[in-house]
Every structure is written in structure tokens, then in C-alpha cells.
């Protein structure tokens, strides 16, 4: 194949791959007709002048995961056809000025996972056709004004995992075609007003895992095409009333892991396309009426691990499409009987790890499609008669770790659990807490003949049983919804070669193994 170096493999498709620790310099001679060259996992430490001079047809060059720490300015001379250049996962601290001169066709430049300390406007001034620039995983502390001014065609810019402490409001001003901007895992404490004003085509903005405390009210007002906004794991304590008002295309918004104390009505919206809203791990204490009413298409709402003690009866107004609601690990003691009434499409609700002492009998009255209910680890002593009778799709109900009072009033619940058991999850069985003579016994195998009579009502009406599937030949499939109920933290949907690591925290949702987060 036109002389393939012994350390490399060359394919008929003009692809050359050179790998191995024995390689300490760019192998020669390289086939003149090579269109793709990969130099991976070698011990090459430097690139000298023009090592690729004779392969001018090259379109893609990947020099990754090497020991590369020094590059001569003329290393890429004569590669006028090159469209893709990756120098990711090396040990570069400095880029020589003019290194990319002459790469007139270059569209993708990957410099991620190096040790770059700074970039200058002159570095990319020749790259007028560049569409993708990956700089994440370096040691950049600031971006000088003008650094990207010549990259007017850029659509994707990743500056994540650096050490940026501030961003100039002018640094992105010429990037009118930018669709993806990632600034995650830096040390940003605030974003100046106007920073994103020029980004009229921006679709994704990743700001998670910084130290942002305040958001300017109009920070996103020019970003009408924004679809994904990641603000999680910052120090945001309040949301200006209008901060999200101009984001009609938004379909993913993450705010978990901040310091939000309250949410004012109308703060979200209108966002007719928002499908998921992640608010866990904040300091929210109450939910007022209509706080989510603009989110007509919302399907996943995660409010777990806050300090919510009060939910107004109309807090969930407008959420007619909601499928998953996570309220676990809060401070709820009581719920209004109408609080879930509008959630006609709700499938999974997690209420575990609260302080619920009782539930209204109509709490799930209009939520006929519920498949999973998590009520474990509350202060429940009994449940109202008939509370689950109409829930024909319920196949996971967790009731353990409550102080069940096993007097004669518990019989309806016990009977309901027994008669419907093949439809429910096989989790830990509820155990009696009182009276003392049955403490520790399983609620469903207590000896009913020694159950203490209830002190308040002599006749215990029971759950109008209607075993969930009356008169059916056998119970339907009992597949657990676990796999859809315990979502992990939302993985920001990145497609870079270097992906973002997101903590897989399965305790967040607490709904079922797939429903954490």
C-alpha cells in the first residue's frame, strides 16, 4: 500500500493507524495517498518540522494519547486538505503561534485533555472554516478578548474542565453560528450581562459545576433557540423573575445541586417544549400555586432532597403531561387531597423519606395511571380506605419503614396487600410498629384474631376491594417499573470524544432502580 511503515497498519481505504509504545517519532515513509492517519498510544514527545509533508491528501489526523509536549510551528505544513485534527490527550502546555496556519480546510480541532495554560487570538486567527473547537480538560484560567473572533463559522465550542474564573462579556460576541457552548466544571462565579447576547443560534449551554451565585435577569434573553441549559451544581440561591422568560425552545433544564430557597410562580416559562426539570438538592421549602403552570409538556419533575414542608394545592397546576414526580427526602408532613388532582398522566410518584403522618383518601383520586408509589420511611400508621382501589396499573408500592399501627383498623390495608400482592414489587414487607404485642411482625401475617380492637371505630369498613383486576383469569404482567422510575442524574447528552462524567447517584429519585436522581 504505497509503503506502509512496519509500526503501522494501512487499509485499502487509505487509512493508516500507528500505535504502540515502541513508536517515538512519526513513522516514515507514510503512504502518499493516506487520507486518514491515527497515531495513538505512542511515546512520541514532539512533532518536528513537516513530518506529514508527503501526505498532502490527508483529511483526518488523530495524534492522541501520546507523550506529546512540544510541537514545531511548521509541523502541519502542506496539509491544506485536512478537515479534522485531534491532538487530544497529550501533554501540551503551549501552542506555538502559527501552528494551524495553512490549514484552510480545517473544520474540527480537538485540543482537549492537555495541559494548555493559555490561548491567544493569534492561535486560531487562520482557522476561518473551523466548526468545532474542543479545549476542555486543560488548565486555562482566562480567555482573552478576541480569542475566537475569527471563528465566525464555529458551531461547537467546549471549554469545560478548565480553571476559568471569569468570562469577558465580549469573548463570544462574534460567534453567531455557535450551537453548542460548554463551560462546565470551571470556577466561574458569575456571568456578566451580555456574555451570550451574540449567540442567537445557541442550542446548548452547559454551565454546570461552577460556582455561579447569581444569574443576571437578562442573561439568556437573546438565546431564543436554546434547547438545553445546564445550571446544576452551582451556588445559585435565587432565580430572577424573568431569567427564563425568553426560552421557548428549551427542552432540558437542570438546576439540581444549587442553593435555591424558593420558586416564584411563573419563573419557568413559557417553555412549551420543556420535558424534564431537575431541581433536586436545593433548599426549597415550599411550592406555591402555579409555580410550574407554564410547563405544559413537562414529563419529569424532580424535587427530591430539598426541605419542602408545604405544597400549595395548586402547585402542580398545568402539569397535565407529567409522568414522573419525585418528592422524596423532604419535610412533608401533610398533603392536600387535591394536590395531585391535575396530574392525570402521572405514572410514578416518590414520596419516601418524608414525615407524612397520614394521606387524604382522595390523594390519588384522579391519577388513575399510577404504576409506582413510594411511601417508605414516613410516619404513616394506616392508610385511608380505598386509597389504591382505582389504580389498575399499580405494580410497585413501597410501604416499609413506617410505624404501622396493627389494630383492627389495619385489616383493610392488610387484606388489600394480600389480595393484590402479585401486582406489587417484592420489596421489604411492611412491619407493625404498634401495639407492642405485634411489634416487628409482618403486617400481612399478623394473627388477625389477636389484633387489638381499634379504640375509635367499632366497625371497620374495608377497602371496597375490587381486587385490581376483578374477574380476570390471572394477574397481568408484573414487570416492575423500577427500571423507569429511578433515573440517574441527568447525563448531559454530550457527544464529544471526551465525555462528561456525571455522578451516577441512584438515591436521588428513589423510585425504582432506574428512577433515582
Amino acid at each position: 500500500y504505497h509503503g506502509c511503515p512496519s509500526e503501522c497498519t494501512c487499509s485499502r481505504a487509505s487509512q493508516v493507524e500507528c500505535t504502540g509504545a515502541r513508536i517515538v517519532a512519526v513513522p516514515t515513509p507514510l503512504p502518499w495517498n493516506a487520507m486518514s492517519l491515527q497515531i495513538l498510544n505512542t511515546h512520541i514527545t514532539e512533532l518536528n518540522e513537516s513530518p506529514f509533508l508527503n501526505i498532502s491528501a490527508l483529511i483526518a489526523l488523530r495524534i492522541e494519547k501520546n507523550e506529546l509536549s512540544r510541537i514545531t510551528p511548521g509541523a502541519f505544513r502542506n496539509l491544506g486538505s485536512l478537515r479534522y485534527l485531534s491532538l487530544a490527550n497529550n501533554k501540551l502546555q503551549v501552542l506555538p503561534i502559527g501552528l494551524f496556519q495553512g490549514l484552510d480546510s480545517l473544520e474540527s480541532l480537538l485540543l482537549s485533555s492537555n495541559q494548555l495554560l493559555q490561548i491567544q487570538p493569534a492561535h486560531f486567527s487562520q482557522c476561518s472554516n473551523l466548526k468545532e473547537l474542543q479545549l476542555h480538560g486543560n488548565h486555562l484560567e482566562y480567555i482573552p478578548d478576541g480569542a475566537f473572533d475569527h471563528l465566525v463559522g464555529l458551531t461547537k465550542l467546549n471549554l469545560g474542565k478548565n480553571s476559568l474564573t471569569h468570562i469577558s462579556p465580549r469573548v463570544f460576541q462574534h460567534l453567531g453560528n455557535l450551537q453548542v457552548l460548554r463551560l462546565y466544571e470551571n470556577r466561574l462565579t458569575d456571568i456578566p450581562m451580555g456574555t451570550f447576547d451574540g449567540l442567537v443560534n445557541l442550542q446548548e449551554l452547559a454551565l454546570q459545576q461552577n460556582q455561579i451565585g447569581l444569574l443576571s435577569p437578562g442573561l439568556f434573553h437573546n438565546n431564543h433557540n436554546l434547547q438545553r441549559l445546564y445550571l446544576s451544581n452551582n451556588h445559585i440561591s435565587q432565580l430572577p423573575p424573568s431569567v427564563f422568560m425568553q426560552l421557548p425552545q428549551l427542552n432540558r433544564l437542570t438546576l439540581f445541586g444549587n442553593s435555591l430557597k424558593e420558586l416564584s410562580p411563573g419563573i419557568f416559562g413559557p417553555m412549551p417544549n420543556l420535558r424534564e426539570l431537575w431541581l433536586y438538592d436545593n433548599h426549597i421549602s415550599s411550592l406555591p400555586d402555579n409555580v410550574f403552570s407554564n410547563l405544559r409538556q413537562l414529563q419529569v419533575l424532580i424535587l427530591s432532597r430539598n426541605q419542602i414542608s408545604f405544597i400549595s394545592p395548586g402547585a402542580f397546576n398545568g402539569l397535565t403531561e407529567l409522568r414522573e414526580l419525585s418528592l422524596h427526602t423532604n419535610a412533608l408532613q401533610d398533603l392536600d387531597g387535591n394536590v395531585f388532582r391535575m396530574l392525570a398522566n402521572l405514572q410514578n410518584i416518590s414520596l419516601q423519606n418524608n414525615r407524612l403522618r397520614q394521606l387524604p383518601g382522595n390523594i390519588f383520586a384522579n391519577v388513575n395511571g399510577l404504576m409506582a408509589i413510594q411511601l417508605q420511611n414516613n410516619q404513616l400508621e394506616n392508610l385511608p380506605l380505598g386509597i389504591f382501589d382505582h389504580l389498575g396499573k399499580l405494580c410497585e408500592l413501597r410501604l416499609y419503614d413506617n410505624p404501622w399501627r396493627c389494630d383492627s383498623d389495619i385489616l383493610p390495608l392488610r387484606n388489600w396487600l394480600l389480595l393484590n400482592q402479585p401486582r406489587l414489587g417484592t420489596d421489604t414487607v411492611p412491619v407493625c410498629f404498634s401495639p407492642a404485642n405485634v411489634r416487628g411482625q409482618s403486617l400481612i401475617i399478623i394473627n388477625v384474631n389477636v389484633a387489638v380492637p381499634s379504640v375509635h371505630v367499632p366497625e371497620v369498613p374495608s377497602y371496597p376491594e375490587t381486587p385490581w383486576y376483578p374477574d380476570t383469569p390471572s394477574y397481568p404482567d408484573t414487570t416492575s417499573v423500577s427500571s423507569t422510575t429511578e433515573l440517574t442524574s441527568p447525563v448531559e447528552d454530550y457527544t464529544d470524544l471526551t465525555t462528561i462524567q456525571v455522578t451516577d447517584d441512584r438515591s436521588v429519585w428513589g423510585m425504582t432502580q432506574a428512577q433515582s436522581g
Epitope: S408, L411, P412, N415, L418, L419, Q421, P422, T426, D427, T428, V429, S442, I444, I445, V448, N449, P458, E459, V460, P461, S462, Y463, P464, E465, T466, P467, P470, D471, S474, Y475
Partner: antibody, heavy 113, light 111 residues
Framework: QVQLVQSGAEVKKPGASVKVSCKAS????????IHWVRQAPGQGLEWISY??????KYNERFRGRATLTSDKSTSTVYMELSSLRSEDTAVYYC????????WGQGTLVTVSS | DIVMTQSPDSLAVSLGERATINCRAS??????????MNWYQQKPGQPPKLLIY???NQGSGVPDRFSGSGSGTDFTLTISSLQAEDVAVYYC?????????FGGGTKVEIK
């Protein structure tokens, strides 16, 4: 004390129906399931159905032939079995609770032409 | 349907000796970590009487010499010291799922 008292023996012709009653006393009627079980002469036990606050569940073998009803005012459960055949000759028992902790004395139903 | 198979069909044991009856289910009768296996005693001309529920829990008024054990598919009823009044037919039953099914019975006699 808990008692389940069943109606007396019946003799029926093939194709006819029979309705057996089970009157409960000594406990809160609405708090417990009532099952029906039958036992053919010299044979084992066969579960037919249960009723709990008007909700019912049937053994497929008896679907369409067995009907359970209850009268809360008299704490009585009824089992009607239709389209009788000779192999339905058996003692029919009612039993209380999910775990069948108390049983009626049984009702002998004889199906004979 | 879950099929319950009892063994032996009949058993003759001397007074004061141990009697053991086995019951095997065609599939597991465990749920919630509980085995939904029950045992009944039936004497001639009488209705059955609940002895053991949920594999190992004694029914009301049942003498301590009756005990149950097992989980999953294999279960045992043990009479630790057979008395004359224990002569009867013993049935196992699963209540994990409808239709609730009984074993064919084991007749216990005195040797």
C-alpha cells in the same frame, strides 16, 4: 366467637342451579375475605372463589358458572353454581380471611338425575 | 396454575413419635420475602382447620407440636410428638396467587 353457619344440604338435577349461603358472626363482616372451597366425596380440596366487599375473584374452572354475592345487612355471603353436572356433587365450604382461618360446617350438594 | 404435590400419600407413626409431611410447589410461592404456604388439618366429617399459615406461623389455638418450615418451593409440616387426636388428613395450600391450590392430602394414622 367467630362463626360461619352454612345453609342445609341440597339435591339438584343436572343443568339446575344451587345457591348456598354462609352467615358470618362474631367479627366485623366487612373486614375479611370469604372464600368458597369444595370437596368431592373422598377427594381433596378445590378453591372456587372469594368475595371481599363485593369484589370477586374466581378460579377459571368456575368462571361463568359460579357467582358470589354478599348481603352486608345480614353478614351473609351466597354462592350460586349453575349448569350443575354430576361431578359437582361435593361438600361446599365457606372460609374466612385470606388464610382460611375459620370454616363453615359445609353444605352437601348432590347432583343426580 | 401452581401445582402442589404432597408426600407421602399416607403416613403411619407411633404415638409420641415425629411425623413429617412434605409439600412441593411447581414454582416459588415466596413474595415480599414471605412464603405463602399454609397447612390444614381435616378430620372425618369435619371442615378443615388452619394449622400453619405463611409457612411457619401457627394458627390460633394450634398446639405447639405443629410446626412448619421451608421456603420457595419446598415445605414441611412437622408434628413433633404425634397424639391420638392428630389422626387426620393434612393438606398444604399456596395462597401466593389465584387460583389458590391445595395438595392432594396426606393421611396420618397411628402405627
Amino acid at each position: 366467637q367467630v362463626q360461619l353457619v352454612q345453609s342445609g344440604a341440597e339435591v339438584k338435577k343436572p343443568g339446575a342451579s344451587v345457591k348456598v349461603s354462609c352467615k358470618a358472626s362474631g367479627y366485623t363482616f366487612t373486614s375479611f375475605v370469604i372464600h368458597w372451597v369444595r370437596q368431592a366425596p373422598g377427594q381433596g380440596l378445590e378453591w372456587i372463589s372469594y368475595i371481599y366487599n363485593d369484589g370477586t375473584k374466581y378460579n377459571e374452572r368456575f368462571r361463568g358458572r359460579a357467582t358470589l354475592t354478599s348481603d352486608k345487612s345480614t353478614s351473609t355471603v351466597y354462592m350460586e353454581l349453575s349448569s350443575l353436572r354430576s361431578e359437582d356433587t361435593a361438600v361446599y365450604y365457606c372460609a374466612r380471611d385470606y388464610y382460611f382461618d375459620y370454616w363453615g360446617q359445609g353444605t352437601l350438594v348432590t347432583v343426580s338425575s | 396454575d401452581i401445582v402442589m404435590t404432597q408426600s407421602p400419600d399416607s403416613l403411619a407413626v407411633s404415638l409420641g413419635e415425629r411425623a413429617t409431611i412434605n409439600c412441593r410447589a411447581s414454582e416459588s410461592v415466596d413474595y415480599y420475602g414471605i412464603s405463602f404456604m399454609n397447612w390444614y388439618q381435616q378430620k372425618p366429617g369435619q371442615p378443615p382447620k388452619l394449622l400453619i399459615y405463611a409457612a411457619s406461623n401457627q394458627g390460633s389455638g394450634v398446639p405447639d407440636r405443629f410446626s412448619g418450615s421451608g421456603s420457595g418451593t419446598d415445605f414441611t409440616l412437622t408434628i413433633s410428638s404425634l397424639q391420638a387426636e392428630d389422626v387426620a388428613v393434612y393438606y398444604c395450600q399456596q395462597s401466593k396467587e389465584v387460583p389458590y391450590t391445595f395438595g392432594g392430602g396426606t393421611k396420618v394414622e397411628i402405627k
